[in-house]
C-alpha cells in the first residue's frame, strides 16, 4: 500500500471547483521533494498537469494551483472551472518522476442536474430570505391561499391568507399580494435556516379546481472561501452581508467544535489573542465591512465566519459568510522580533520589512488603537509628515532596495507602549505588527549630549558633543537634523575614532557637531545616533534654541566638553561644521535624485547607501569625508 493518502473519489458539477488534499509521511525528504498531480492515460502513463516545481500544463492554465503545507505534511491541488472533460483517473504523488510514491484519485464531473419542469427551485443562503411566487387562476381569487411544507406523511401548514402561521414561522413568514394583480400571491420567509430546506406546495382554492405549485427550497451553508496566507503576513476578510443588515452590529468569529467564538465585533468586543493586530472597518451603508488581521500566526488557521446581528454575536437565521484560512509556514516574510523593548528617555529602532520588489512604495508607520472598531492612525511616512505630538522624536529612514525601512522613536515615555504597524501602499500582505514595551529606566542612557541646555547664539560658533560608551566604538556615529520630513544626516567628526590606542577611554568617546556661524535656521531638534551599516541603533535628541546676543553680554563660555572637543578639532585642523541651508537643498530626494547633489548635501539616503556598501570606494570616501567637510554660511 502507498504511504500517500487522499480522497479516493471526488465528484463535482460543471463550473464548480475542487480542493484535493494529499497526505504524505512526516519525513524531511518528503517535505522538500517535488509534489505532482498527473492524469492517468489508457497506456498507464501519467501526464503531469501541475507540480510544485512550478510546472503548469496548458489545460490547467489560470484555473489550478498546487500548494505544499510541509508543517502539516500535506499538499493541496485546487482546480476551478471544472468541465466534464476533467472526469478521469489521477494520481497525486511525491518524487522526481511520476513513478514515485502516489495515490489514485478518481474525479467525476457531472452536468448540473435538471429538475422536473413543474418544480420551481429557490436556492438561498442561510440567514437570507426567499419570496416564493404562487400563481393561480382568477376563479380562485376569492379562495384561501396557503403554503405548506411537505413532510413524510402530509403537508404541514406554513402560512395561509386567514393569518394562520405555523409557530416555527411566526415573525418570519408573510403572505401578501402585490398591487392589483389577482393572479399571483407571494410568501416571504426571512432568516432562513437549514431546517427550512425542503419541498413546499403553494395552493389557491380547494378540491380538484385548486391551483397548486411545487417548490423546492434549498438552503445552503455558504461555501467557505479558501484563503492561503503566509506566516507573519496579513489577511483581510471582506464581508458583504447585504443591505438588509446594514444597521446591525457586525462580527467576525472563529468556529470551534460547539460554537463560533467572536474575535471582533462593532460593539467593542475583541479577543485578547488578536490585540494589536486586528481592525474592523465598516465599508458602506450596504452591510459591507472588512476585518484585517496582521502578523498571522500558525494558530490563526481555521474556519472563520462573519455575520450581523444586533447582539454582535452569531445568531441562527442571520446571514453569514465563511472562510477557511490556511497559514503557510514557508513564508517569504522575514522572521522579525514582534516585541521591541525600550526604557523611558531612551530610544528604539524598529526594522520594518517590505516586499523588496516594491522598493519605491510609500512606507508608513501607524499606532494601533483599540478603542471602538480599532484604527491605526499614521504617525510617519515617506511622504507623510510626522504627527505634531511626535515632533523631534520620530523619523522614518528608507533604505531603498534592501527590503527594510527603519523607524526610530526616541525620548520614550511609558505612554509610547503599545502596538504599531509597519505598512506600505504596496503589497498589503507585508503589514507587520510590533509591540513596543517601555520600562522605567534604571541607569544612565548610553548616549548623552552636552551641553544639555542647548542655546546657541546667532553668528557665533556652537558645538554639541555626544558621548557614547566603548561598546559603540566600532559603530558608525552620526548627527542628523530632524524635520517633520525625516532626520537628515550631517557631516560629523568622531573623536574617538582618531585615537590609535587599543584600549577604550570611557571619558573620551564623543562625536561632535559644530554650527559655525549659527543661523536662525539652525534652531530645532538634532539627533545623535549609532548605526552599523544599514542597521540603526540607539539615538538621543537635543533641541537647540537660537537667540540673538544680548547687547553688552560677554562671549558665552563653552562647557568643558565643548572646550575638549575644540582642542581635538584644532589638533586635526578640521572644522566639522555644517551648512543647514545646503542640507535643505534636497529635503527628500526621490529614488532617482542626482547622486552628486545628494553626496554634496550629505543627505541621509546617500549616507545609508554608502554605509551599506562599506567595501566600495564611494563608501570609503563618503564616511571619511564626513570628517573633512568644511562649510561656511
Amino acid at each position: 500500500k502507498s504511504p500517500i493518502f487522499g480522497p479516493q473519489e471526488v465528484s463535482s458539477i460543471e463550473g464548480d471547483s475542487v480542493s484535493i488534499t494529499c497526505y504524505y509521511p512526516d519525513t524531511s525528504v518528503n517535505r522538500h521533494t517535488r509534489k505532482y498531480w498527473c492524469r492517468q492515460g489508457a497506456s498507464g502513463m501519467c501526464t503531469t498537469l501541475i507540480s510544485s516545481n512550478g510546472y503548469l500544463s496548458k489545460e490547467y492554465s489560470g484555473r489550478a494551483n498546487l500548494i505544499n503545507f510541509p508543517e502539516n505534511n500535506t499538499f493541496v491541488i485546487n482546480i476551478e472551472q471544472l468541465t466534464q472533460d476533467d472526469t478521469g483517473s489521477y494520481k497525486c504523488g511525491l518524487g522526481t518522476s511520476n513513478r514515485g510514491l502516489s495515490f489514485d484519485v478518481s474525479l467525476e464531473v457531472s452536468q448540473v442536474p435538471e429538475l422536473p419542469s413543474d418544480t420551481h427551485v429557490y436556492t438561498k443562503d442561510i440567514g437570507r430570505n426567499v419570496t416564493i411566487e404562487c400563481p393561480f387562476k382568477r376563479e380562485n381569487a376569492p379562495s384561501k391561499k396557503s403554503l405548506c411544507k411537505k413532510t413524510n406523511q402530509s403537508c404541514e401548514l406554513v402560512i395561509d391568507s386567514t393569518e394562520k402561521v405555523n409557530p416555527s414561522y411566526i415573525g418570519r413568514a408573510k403572505l401578501f399580494m402585490k398591487g392589483t394583480d389577482l393572479t399571483v400571491f407571494y410568501v416571504n420567509i426571512s432568516h432562513l435556516t437549514h431546517n427550512d430546506a425542503g419541498l413546499y406546495i403553494c395552493q389557491a382554492g380547494e378540491g380538484p379546481s385548486a391551483d397548486k405549485k411545487n417548490v423546492d427550497l434549498q438552503v445552503l451553508a455558504p461555501e467557505p472561501e479558501l484563503l492561503y496566507k503566509d506566516l507573519r503576513s496579513s489577511v483581510t476578510f471582506e464581508c458583504d452581508l447585504g443591505r438588509e443588515v446594514a444597521n446591525e452590529a457586525k462580527y467576525l468569529c472563529r468556529m470551534n467544535k460547539e460554537t463560533c467564538d467572536v474575535i471582533i465585533n462593532t460593539l467593542g468586543k475583541r479577543d485578547p489573542d488578536f490585540e494589536g493586530r486586528i481592525l474592523i472597518t465598516p465599508k458602506d451603508d450596504n452591510g459591507r465591512f472588512s476585518v484585517l488581521i496582521t502578523g498571522l500566526r500558525k494558530e490563526d488557521a481555521g474556519h472563520y465566519q462573519c455575520g450581523a446581528h444586533s447582539s454582535g454575536l452569531p445568531q441562527e437565521g442571520w446571514p453569514i459568510q465563511t472562510w477557511q484560512l490556511f497559514v503557510n509556514e514557508e513564508s517569504t516574510i522575514p522572521n522579525r522580533r514582534s516585541v521591541v523593548k525600550g526604557v523611558t528617555g531612551g530610544s528604539v529602532a524598529i526594522a520594518c520589512p517590505y516586499n523588496p520588489k516594491e522598493s519605491s512604495s510609500l512606507k508608513y508607520w501607524c499606532r494601533w488603537e483599540g478603542d471602538g472598531n480599532g484604527h491605526c492612525p499614521v504617525l510617519v511616512g515617506t511622504q507623510a509628515q510626522v504627527q505634531e505630538e511626535y515632533e523631534g522624536r520620530l523619523a522614518l529612514f528608507d533604505q531603498p532596495g534592501n527590503g527594510t525601512y527603519t523607524v526610530i522613536l526616541n525620548q520614550l515615555t511609558t505612554e509610547d507602549a503599545g502596538f504599531y504597524w509597519c505598512l506600505t501602499n504596496g503589497d498589503s500582505r507585508w503589514r507587520t505588527t510590533i509591540e513596543l514595551q517601555v520600562a522605567e529606566a534604571t541607569r544612565e542612557p548610553n548616549l548623552e549630549v552636552t551641553p544639555q541646555n542647548a542655546t546657541a547664539v546667532l553668528g557665533e560658533t556652537f558645538t554639541v558633543s555626544c558621548h557614547y560608551p566603548c561598546k559603540f566604538y566600532s559603530q558608525e556615529k552620526y548627527w542628523c537634523k530632524w524635520s517633520n520630513k525625516g532626520c537628515h544626516i550631517l557631516p560629523s567628526h568622531d573623536e574617538g575614532a582618531r585615537q590609535s590606542s587599543v584600549s577604550c577611554d570611557q571619558s573620551s568617546q564623543l562625536v561632535s557637531m559644530t554650527l559655525n556661524p549659527v543661523s536662525k535656521e539652525d534652531e530645532g531638534w538634532y539627533w545623535c545616533g549609532v548605526k552599523q551599516g544599514q542597521t540603526y541603533g540607539e539615538t538621543t535628541a537635543i533641541y537647540i534654541a537660537v537667540e540673538e546676543r544680548t547687547r553688552g553680554s560677554s562671549h558665552v563660555n563653552p562647557t568643558d566638553a565643548n572646550a575638549r572637543a575644540k582642542v581635538a578639532l584644532e589638533e586635526e585642523v578640521v572644522d566639522s561644521s555644517i551648512s543647514e541651508k545646503e542640507n535643505k537643498a534636497i529635503p527628500n530626494p526621490g529614488p532617482f535624485a542626482n547622486e552628486r547633489e545628494i553626496q554634496n548635501v550629505g543627505d541621509q539616503a546617500q549616507e545609508n547607501r554608502a554605509s551599506g556598501d562599506a567595501g566600495s570606494a564611494d563608501g570609503q570616501s563618503r564616511s571619511s569625508s564626513s570628517k573633512h567637510h568644511h562649510h561656511h554660511h
Partner: nanobody, 130 residues
Framework: QVQLVESGGGLVQTGGSLRLSCAAS????????MGWFRQAPGKEREFVAA??????????YVGDSVQGRFTISRDAAGNTVYLQMNSVKPEDTAVYYC?????????????????????WGKGTLVTVSS
C-alpha cells in the same frame, strides 16, 4: 446538542453484506464531514471511511484495509451517512463508530486521525461469523 445515532449492525456471514446508517441530529447541526471508524476488542480505533462535502462537491476517503469492499455515501440532506459493507471478513468484526465534523478542516487535518473529529456516536456492533 448534537447526536449521532448508528444503526444496521448485527451478525453477518463471511462474504456477506451489511449496510450501516448514521443519522446526525441537533438544532442547526449541519455537518461538513462524516465518517466511520471501528474498534475491535483490545485494538486501537481504526479509520474505515469518510465523506466530506462542500456545495456540490463530495470527497470520499476509504481506509486501506477495506478498499474495494466498503463504500461510503450520504443522503441528499447530508445528515445521514451510510457504510455499505460487501465481501465481509471475520477481521471486520468490531464496534463501528460514526463520527462527524461541523467545521471544514480537511486540508490541514487527516481524516484518518480519530482525534480530529468533533462528534461521535455510541457505536454499533458488527460480528462476522466464519
Amino acid at each position: 446538542q448534537v447526536q449521532l445515532v448508528e444503526s444496521g449492525g448485527g451478525l453477518v456471514q463471511t462474504g456477506g453484506s451489511l449496510r450501516l446508517s448514521c443519522a446526525a441530529s441537533g438544532r442547526t447541526f449541519s455537518p461538513y464531514a462524516m465518517g466511520w471508524f471501528r474498534q475491535a476488542p483490545g485494538k486501537e480505533r481504526e479509520f474505515v471511511a469518510a465523506i466530506r462535502w462542500s456545495g456540490a462537491t463530495t470527497y470520499k476517503y476509504v481506509g486501506d484495509s477495506v478498499q474495494g469492499r466498503f463504500t461510503i455515501s450520504r443522503d441528499a440532506a447530508g445528515n445521514t451517512v451510510y457504510l455499505q459493507m460487501n465481501s465481509v471478513k471475520p477481521e471486520d468484526t468490531a464496534v463501528y463508530y460514526c463520527a462527524a465534523d461541523r467545521v471544514p478542516k480537511d486540508i490541514s487535518i487527516d481524516p484518518r486521525n480519530p482525534k480530529d473529529w468533533d462528534y461521535w456516536g455510541k457505536g454499533t456492533l458488527v460480528t462476522v461469523s466464519s
